[in-house]
């Protein structure tokens, strides 16, 4: 799998999409997980509804939400109020029993807010009371890592 880069602006929302073959993964729940190091496990962040037929319903864990268009074959993850610590490697997964297939490898990059010269008091940080539906979703910039680029830079 190539890694697709999604860039979002700090404080705003980022939408990550993972297309898949809807028939190949028919009946399978999906998940979004965070890769812990190059060889480490992928730690589950959020998964779609326990009942596959209700996968279109948005499920959330903290500031991350997931919804699945099972007919169209697109898994969508929304990271709200993007923060620097959200940057990193993730995977979209298709679940089959205790197995997981990788649908897409994703690198989330968080860009500095161009308005961060303002006072902190002027910054809008979505509160828990505000729903995902109300949150502004920035059209994410995405690209695949170029050949030769290292997805996990070596640690010194």
């Amino acid at each position: 799998h190539n890694t697709t880069v999604f860039q979002g602006v700090e404080g705003q929302s980022l939408q990550v999409s993972c297309p898949y073959d809807s028939m190949k993964h028919w009946g399978r729940r999906k998940a979004w997980c965070r890769q812990l190091g190059e060889k480490g496990p992928c730690q589950r962040v959020v998964s779609t509804h326990n009942l596959w037929l209700l996968s279109f319903l948005r499920r959330r864990n903290g500031s991350t939400a997931i919804t699945d268009d099972t007919l169209g074959g697109t898994l969508t993850i929304t990271l709200r109020n993007l923060q620097p610590h959200d940057a990193g490697f993730y995977q979209c997964q298709s679940l089959h029993g205790s197995e997981a297939d990788t649908l897409r490898k994703v690198l989330v990059e968080v860009l500095a807010d161009p308005l961060d010269h303002r006072d902190a008091g002027d910054l809008w940080v979505p509160g828990e009371s505000e729903s995902f539906e109300d949150a502004h979703v920035e059209h994410s910039i995405s690209r695949s890592l170029l050949e030769g680029e290292i997805p996990f830079p070596p640690t010194s």
Epitope: K24, L53, H96
Partner: antibody
Framework: EVQLVQSGAEVKKPGESLKISCKGS????????IGWVRQMPGKGLEWMGI????????RYSPSFQGQVTISADKSISTAYLQWSTLKASDTAIYYC???????????????WGQGTMVTVSS | EFVLTQSPGTLSLSPGERATLSCRAS???????LAWYQQKPGQAPRLLIY???SRATGIPDRFSGSGSGTDFTLTISRLEPEDFAVYYC?????????FGRGTRLDIK
């Protein structure tokens, strides 16, 4: 009618190669996983591996990895199981079967081929 | 890999009697991923039960499946002459997919 029709019985010598087939009809062949199952004489069922004809994604049981090759030609709705070097211990009936796509439980084999008897003897 | 142990190995009963076949897994299986098959001599297996308890299309209601976790049961409420065959359980919760060794149901 939804069915899987397998190629006929084969008699081979050890060391020879073989490719058996499984042709699907009556449904969208590219939309269902196809599995292969071995049944040695008088024994039970052993899962060998599966293939998704839509993109030829293939998974093997560790017991059969490197021993056989599973492939598919979606243009003629046919899956294949092949050996490059047969052994006497490969003598068995080989079944192809379709994975059902029941929501929340995809994976049971709902449609089976009639089986192909492979005899390997010198 | 998941090991499925079926018992008894052979069950001898008469038509009209009730048959209870057991399948025990070495690890917990999600009920959604357990199936039962029937195989008669010279024939391919036939799917009877999926998701541990759901009957496949065209399967008579005398066949029922139950269980969860590691213990699963196939029950044939009233045996008909055509029910005497070999029965296999199968898990597809984890790769590799595995089958039990089978229970042979013989006419007494």
């Amino acid at each position: 009618e939804v069915q899987l029709v397998q190629s006929g019985a084969e008699v081979k010598k050890p060391g020879e190669s073989l490719k058996i087939s499984c042709k699907g009809s009556g449904y969208s062949f590219t939309s269902y996983w196809i599995g292969w199952v071995r049944q040695m004489p008088g024994k039970g069922l052993e899962w060998m591996g599966i293939i998704y004809p839509g993109d030829s994604d293939t998974r093997y049981s560790p017991s059969f990895q490197g021993q056989v090759t599973i492939s598919a030609d979606k243009s003629i709705s046919t899956a294949y199981l092949q050996w490059s070097t047969l052994k006497a211990s490969d003598t068995a009936i080989y079944y192809c079967a379709r994975h059902d796509i029941i929501p929340a439980a995809p994976g049971a084999f709902d449609i089976w081929g009639q089986g192909t008897m492979v005899t390997v003897s010198s | 890999e998941f090991v499925l142990t079926q018992s008894p190995g052979t069950l001898s009963l008469s038509p009209g009697e009730r048959a209870t076949l057991s399948c025990r897994a070495s690890q917990i299986i999600s009920s959604n991923y357990l199936a039962w098959y029937q195989q008669k001599p010279g024939q391919a297996p036939r799917l009877l039960i999926y998701s541990a308890s759901s009957r496949a299309t065209g399967i008579p209601d005398r066949f029922s499946g139950s269980g969860s976790g590691t213990d699963f049961t196939l029950t044939i409420s009233r045996l008909e002459p055509e029910d005497f065959a070999v029965y296999y359980c199968q898990q597809f919760d984890s790769s590799p997919i595995t089958f039990g060794r089978g229970t042979r149901l013989d006419i007494k």
